[in-house]
């Protein structure tokens, strides 16, 4: 036999809180347990579902957990069913509702003196208790005409009059909570002796010195008082105005008016009205000074022809806003059209050359007006004044390449030579209108140039061959003073270049011809054999058709050329010893003798008490120190001529002698001894 | 060779106003644009405007506008920067500078301290 | 206006090492085949020194280890090698249109 251990019972439960019904089964066999509301199965859902052989719920519903609940018990097998006892909820709840008016039907038949019920639609169970509000204030029953009837939850004013007027509101508790009314319900019931609003005054805005009108009336039986009101709370009277409101009125039907107005009248006006009873009504405005502010500056603007393009006017801050208007040529532009106005832009729509000039972009407001110009540039593409020509540029004179163009803006002009952009420097200049100069034209200035010039529109360009009339010159020039080896062969070069190639020949400063062992061999002056007779001064002439002639002089001395007689040698010496250093040069002119040492020339006339300098050119050193160590270089030369050797020089500590040595023992090494 | 020289240092009171100096020397103004720069130590170099003091011709930095005039004199081939309305904002050293239609400035002056200080 | 963007705001490198400073332009400072983007050197006291014009050129006197590169709006300015004398502040220029406006400027040192 089935036996049910635990069985449903009936219980209270909380709307939207969990519950939970036991059923708790023994049997011999295998039974299935399920659940019927009202005789009908229960189905699972996420709210309500079985838990084991109890039915849980994770919310309780008012609606769909209503009625009866069984647990039934089945054994399959044998058929054999077992019921549980019923079980059911008492489901505390409650819900907010509004308050509706219940008589009379509708609000237009309210009526001063006639009765007014409103009703509270908070429903809950247990039956809820009310509690009413008027403006957010309890209202008790048996008070000031009104009636609380808690079981018909309703309130009767009998009858209603003005003091009614307001938000009523109700709020219901019961043991499972409390709700207040969702919508509540505004009574209002006029009284003849309360003010009420017959024209309220309106924000206004002035400019500076004019005049501001503030309208205000109000209505009651009898009729209401009317007063004026400054921010600081002061009265406005004719009688009694304050100190910065000197020049105001207040006129019979309420209106203030306010003449030659400034900043400091500026502010929030209030206008209150007062019937014989009821609360005083308070109606703002306020006086707002017009303002204008500076327009931004405008870029000017360069535009191409063809295209379209918009510049957008940014209104000044203002109050009221400033409307705003573009005008050109003093006339203001239309709203459609092809340059025309759309919103706060000029619109320039397929940009023709003649849309060029100063547009405006006016600003207003009653404080004033504002303007701001705009520079419209339409660019051309360049044309040609002058286009660069191939020329002829003299070496070593200033040249010129023009490349002249106009255009809208000053168009830029950038030049190439070979290909690669020319900068400014010394021997570049490009002039602002294109011109190109060269300082000091060279020959390898002649080659291919161009120019272009530029604007937004376009550019164009040209170029133009360079050729360089090279200058009749030596190249290079001869030396004015050179030496040639008495009784050796000698060649003295001369070469020149020009337009034409240039004949260059040799003679005598004197005039006097060439000996027979001198040749001119295009230019190069040959000596077979030096001679004493061959010094003197020649003239090398270069000459062409169209450049003339040019001279060379030079001066030519024959001379023996150094040779040394005697060569310093590698040397050491004891430390505190004198060192000497030999050298001699013969040669003719004379060879002069000077001496280098670590790398310095050794002035004779500052050499100190230590060292000296031969007339024959030898080099003493006395008292020798570790740091007169070192390469001596001994320099020979004449006008003609130079020639040099060098030696070192080893300082030395003198070695104590050793027994086994004896006294007459050669050093290890080449010494001078003193 | 090409030199600009220009006026020796400012010391202004603020709402003064100063007009700078640039004297060219080996070339004539005529043949190119003359540009105005200023350096701020914090604010680095600012483009001011140019003239082309052939005929006159001015165009100015939005922000310069008001600020700053660029005028030239051809028959003494100088060109001048004035500064209205000064304030501790337009201390600065001012260069002028030598560009040709060709728009790089190879050439500049050696520059002006102006000190605006009460 | 075209805003041209410096960077780095300051370098330090190695004698002899490489330096690139970057320069960006708000738009293309292009025009016909020339990329008008200059690059000056300027020292304490001096006035500003033209390295190199139209994004690559270099400026009279100018030695070659100083390059630009870039075209469009990204430019380049390569020093290498490093010199002691090349401790200056760097700046980007565009003359591609009025006004002509400058990058806001590089401090190299050596490091």
């Known amino acids: 036999a089935i036996v049910f251990i635990k069985q449903p019972s009936s219980q209270d439960a909380l709307q939207g809180r969990r519950a939970l019904l036991r059923c708790e089964v023994e049997a011999p066999g295998p039974v299935h347990v399920y659940w019927l509301l009202d005789g009908a199965p229960v189905q699972d859902t996420e709210r309500r579902f079985a838990q084991g052989s109890s039915l849980s719920f994770a919310a309780v519903d008012r609606l769909q957990d209503s009625g009866t609940f069984q647990c039934v018990a089945r054994d399959d097998v044998t058929g054999e069913e077992a019921r549980s006892a019923n079980a059911s909820f008492n489901i505390k709840w409650i819900e907010a509702g509004p308050v509706v008016l219940k008589h009379p039907a509708s609000e237009a038949e309210i009526q001063p003196q006639t009765q007014v019920t409103l009703r509270c639609h908070i429903d809950g169970h247990p039956r809820p208790t009310y509690q009413w509000f008027r403006d957010g204030t309890p209202l008790s029953d048996g008070q000031s005409n009104h009636t609380v009837s808690s079981k018909e939850r309703n309130l009767t004013l009998r009858p209603a009059g003005p003091e009614h007027s307001g938000l009523y509101s109700c709020c219901a508790h019961s043991a499972f909570g409390q709700a207040c009314s969702s919508q509540n319900f505004t009574l209002s019931i006029a009284d003849e002796s309360f003010a009420r609003v017959v024209l309220a005054p309106q924000d206004v805005v002035v400019a500076r010195y004019e005049e501001a009108m503030f309208h205000c009336q109000f209505s009651a039986q009898p009729p209401p008082s009317l007063q004026w009101l400054f921010e600081d709370e002061t009265p406005i009277t004719n009688r009694s105005r304050p100190p910065h409101l000197r020049r105001a009125t207040v006129f019979a039907n309420g209106s203030l008016l306010l003449t030659q107005v400034r900043p400091r009248n500026a502010g929030i006006y209030r206008c209150i009205g007062q019937g014989q009873r009821g609360p005083p009504i308070i109606l703002e405005a306020t006086l707002h000074l017009a303002e204008i502010e500076d327009m931004p500056l405008f870029e000017p603007r360069v535009f191409t022809a063809g295209s379209e393009e918009r510049v957008t006017c940014l209104p000044p801050k203002g109050l009221p806003e400033p409307s705003v208007w573009w005008e050109h040529a003093g006339v203001r532009l239309p709203t459609h059209g092809r340059v025309y106005q759309k919103g706060h832009e000029l619109v320039l729509a397929n940009i023709a050359e003649s849309d060029a000039g100063v547009y405006t972009c006016h600003a207003a407001n009653l404080a004033g007006q504002r303007r701001q110009d705009v520079n419209i540039t339409v660019a051309t593409v360049p044309s040609w004044l002058k286009k660069p020509q191939d020329s002829q540029l003299e070496e070593g004179k200033p040249g010129y390449l023009d490349c002249l163009t106009q255009a809208t803006p000053k168009p830029t002009v950038v030049w190439y030579r070979n290909q690669m952009l020319i900068s400014e420097d010394s021997r570049f200049e490009v002039f602002k209108n294109g011109t190109l100069r060269i300082n000091s034209v060279e020959v390898y200035d002649g080659t291919w140039y161009r120019c272009m010039s530029s604007t937004p529109a376009g550019s164009i360009e040209a170029q133009a061959r360079v050729q360089v009339l090279e200058k009749l010159k030596f190249t290079p020039p001869p030396q004015p003073q050179q030496c040639m080896e008495f009784d050796k062969e000698a060649t003295v070069p001369c070469s020149a270049t020009g337009r034409e190639k240039p004949t260059i020949k040799w003679e005598r400063a004197d005039g006097s011809s060439l000996p027979e062992w001198v040749t001119d061999n295009a230019g190069t002056l040959h000596f077979a054999r030096v001679t004493r007779d061959d010094a003197g001064n020649y003239t090398c002439i270069a000459s062409n058709g169209p450049q003339g002639q040019i001279r060379a002089h030079v001066q030519l001395t024959v001379a023996v050329f150094i040779t040394f007689k005697v060569e310093p040698e590698r040397t050491t010496v004891y430390q505190g010893h004198t060192a000497l250093l030999q050298c001699e040069a013969q040669g003719d002119p004379k060879p002069l003798i000077q001496w280098k040492g670590k790398d310095r020339i050794l002035d004779p006339t500052k050499l100190g008490p230590r060292m000296h300098i031969f007339q024959n050119g030898s080099l003493v050193i006395h008292d020798v120190a570790p740091e007169d160590s070192g390469r001596y270089t001994c320099i020979a030369g004449n006008s003609c001529n130079i020639k040099h050797t060098e030696a070192p020089l080893y300082v030395v500590d003198k070695p104590v002698p050793e027994e086994s040595e004896g006294p007459g023992s050669p050093p290890p090494y080449k010494m001078i001894q003193t | 060779q090409v030199q600009l020289q220009q006026s020796g240092a400012e010391l202004v009171k603020p709402g003064a106003s100063v007009k700078l100096s640039c004297t060219a020397s080996?070339?004539?103004?005529?043949?190119?644009?003359i540009h105005w720069v200023k350096l701020r130590t914090e604010q680095g170099l600012e483009w001011i405007g140019r003239?082309?003091?052939?005929?006159?011709?001015?165009k100015y930095a939005p922000k310069f506008q008001g600020k700053a005039t660029i005028t030239a004199d051809t028959s003494s081939n100088t060109a001048y920067l004035q500064l209205s309305s000064l304030t501790s904002e337009d201390t600065a050293v001012y260069y002028c500078?030598?560009?040709?239609?060709?728009?790089?400035?190879?050439?500049w002056g050696q520059g002006t301290l102006v000190t605006v200080s009460a | 206006d075209i805003v041209l963007t410096q960077s780095p705001a300051s370098l330090a490198v190695s004698l002899g090492q490489r330096a690139t400073i970057s320069c960006r332009a708000s738009?293309?400072?292009?025009?016909?085949?020339?990329?008008?983007m200059n690059w000056f050197q300027q020292k304490p006291g001096q006035p500003p020194k033209l390295l190199i014009y139209?994004?690559?050129n270099q400026g009279s006197g100018v030695p070659a280890r100083f390059s630009g590169s870039g075209s469009g709006t990204d430019f380049r300015l390569n020093i290498h090698p490093m010199e002691e004398d090349d401790t200056a502040m760097y700046f980007c220029?565009?003359?591609?249109?009025?006004?002509?406006?400058f990058g806001g400027g590089t401090k190299l040192e050596i490091k």
């Open positions: 500078a030598r560009a040709s239609s060709g728009p790089w400035f190879a050439y």
């Open positions: 139209a994004a690559s």
């Open positions: 003239i082309d003091p052939e005929d006159g011709e001015t």
């Open positions: 738009e293309s400072v292009d025009n016909y085949g020339i990329s008008f």
């Open positions: 080996d070339f004539n103004i005529k043949d190119f644009y």
């Open positions: 220029q565009q003359s591609k249109e009025i006004p002509w406006t």
